[in-house]
Structure formats: C-alpha cells, structure tokens
C-alpha cells in the first residue's frame, strides 16, 4: 500500500512535515501535535512578554 | 491490503498484568501511527493511545483514564506493536482493537478480548 | 476532554428509507488554518471490528458507499444513509481527533424494519 503525500508544496512553503493528517505540526516544539494543542511563535511587538496565541498551518492531503 | 491482528487476551486477575500484541502487514510499519482503542461488552469506543512513526521518534500519546498503567511499545524488526497493561481493574474489561492512524483510525484489527475477574 | 453525544440512541428504518443520525461535540472541531473540521463516522457491524467511513467531517473512505455522507461544521454534525440496504445494520460512531485523548459518541444502532 503507497503511503500518500504527507503536504503539498509550494515554491517558498515550508518543507513538508512528518505528520499523519490527522495532525499538525508545531514549528515551536518541533514535533508533530493536535492541531488544538499548536503552539506556534509569532513575533513579539516591542515590551510584549505574553505568549504566542496559538496559530499554525496543517498541510492538507 | 493492509492487516491487524491482535492477540494476547485472555482471563486475568485484578491487580495483574497483560500484553497485547498487533502484528502487521500490508504496509511498512516504521512509517505509520499506531493506536489502541478499546471497547467494553455492549458499550461504546474509547481511545486509548497511540504511537507515532519514525519520522517523529515513536513518540506516544496516551488518554489519561489509562496514562501510567498502559504502555505503547513496537518491535519494528517484527512488525508488530504492542499494549502493556498493569495493575488491572474490572472495568478494564473490553475487546481491545489496534487500528492504523491516518486520516483517523484507518484500519482496524479483529480485536481480542481481556476479562479482568478474580 | 471533548464529549461527543450521538443521537438518537437507536432507530429503526425500513430498506430504501433516509437516515439522518446526529453528532454534537462540545467544542468546536474546526481548525480555522485549513477549515478542516477533524471529526470522524465508523461503522461497526455485529461481531465485527468498526470501520471508517467518513474523515474530515465529509470526505468518504475510499470504497464507501456513496449512500453515506457526512456533513456539518463546527460542533454540529450529520451522517445520513441516502437510501438503506439491509447491510447498513450497524451502530454508527462518531470520534472526533481534534484534540487529545480523541473521543468518541455513544453511538447510534440503527435497526431494520
């Protein structure tokens, strides 16, 4: 059975991740989660100390 | 076609200790999740855990109603994963399916069935 | 955890008749980056192991009837059997994944008339 591809890429995407559909991958921790469970950093504006909201993208099949 | 088939079930006491086995075929087993689910006579499906492939360490998550008791193992040379059960209860008493992660829970094995009763 | 509730608990239909079985989560499935709503149907046939049927809320397993489908957004969910076959004797099982630990419905048994 051929294992289908795991994301589509574009020219300036990011590589593709080692996660099964169901879940998505977490640019923080660098490991595959539950997309509810993402924790994905964004820059900070000056004096923010606050954490990262939780945003992410999941390659589809 | 890909296939399940668990086995190791059987009677045991409470308190004592079980491990369920997976063999699998059909696919390469180092590129995929694999999970546990179990499900008491006449009641309905509960997750149990499951573990990631290669690509991601064969890193486990697991339901915390079982979180400490069970394991999720593989043996990759032997295609074949398994459930570590400790410290059984009553209430462990269930048909327990390994199913194949995908999309969700792909495929499923035929199930074996543990009693837990003194 | 996410609870999943299924309704009704149980129906029975005669061969030829629709079917609709619902699936409410109590918090929302949809993951606005990709508009996937991560809710899965299974079918579980007696004595048998479950089967998927439907992941991604609408998309059908490759050898599905086409008489099943699944639909919905959100928290609110719908699997319906376009016409029923004798086959189709089965509890129905939603699962969402989400979130960990992935949870699943009661289930719905459907009976033939």
């Known amino acids: 059975m051929r294992r289908g591809p795991r994301s589509l890429r574009g020219r300036d995407a990011p590589a593709p991740t080692p996660c099964v559909p169901a879940e998505c991958f977490d640019l923080l921790v660098r490991h595959c989660v539950a997309c509810a469970l993402l924790r994905t950093p964004r820059p900070k504006p000056a004096g923010a100390s606050s954490p990262a909201p939780r945003t992410a993208l999941q390659p589809q099949e | 076609e890909v296939k399940l088939v668990e086995s190791g079930g059987g009677l045991v006491q409470p308190g004592g200790s079980l491990r369920l086995s997976c063999a699998i075929s059909g696919f390469t087993v180092t590129a995929y999740y694999m999970s546990w689910v179990r499900q008491p006579p006449g009641k309905a499906l509960e997750w149990l855990g499951f573990?990631?492939?290669?690509?991601?360490?064969?890193?486990?998550e697991y339901n915390p109603s079982v979180k400490g008791r069970f394991t999720i193992s593989r043996d990759n040379s032997q295609s074949i994963f398994y459930l570590q059960m400790n410290t059984l209860r009553a209430e462990d008493s269930a048909t327990y399916y390994c199913a194949q992660v995908r999309r969700a829970l792909d495929y499923w094995g035929q199930g074996t069935t543990v009693t837990v009763s003194a | 955890d996410i609870v999943m509730s299924q309704s009704p608990s149980s129906l029975a239909v005669s061969v030829g008749e629709k079917v609709t079985m619902s699936c409410k989560s109590s918090?929302?499935?949809?993951?606005?980056?990709?508009?996937?709503?991560?809710l899965a149907w299974y079918q579980q046939k007696p004595g048998q192991s479950p089967k998927l049927l439907i992941y991604w809320a609408s998309t059908r397993e490759s050898g599905v009837p086409d008489r099943f489908t699944g639909s919905g957004s959100g928290t609110d969910f719908t699997l319906t059997i376009s016409s029923v076959k004798a086959e189709d004797l089965a509890v129905y099982y939603c699962?969402?994944?989400?979130?960990?630990?992935?949870?699943f419905g009661g289930g719905t048994k459907l009976e033939i008339k």
């Open positions: 918090q929302s499935l949809l993951y606005s980056s990709n508009q996937n709503n991560y």
């Open positions: 699962q969402q994944y989400y979130t960990y630990p992935y949870t």
């Open positions: 573990i990631r492939d290669k690509a991601n360490g064969y890193t486990t």
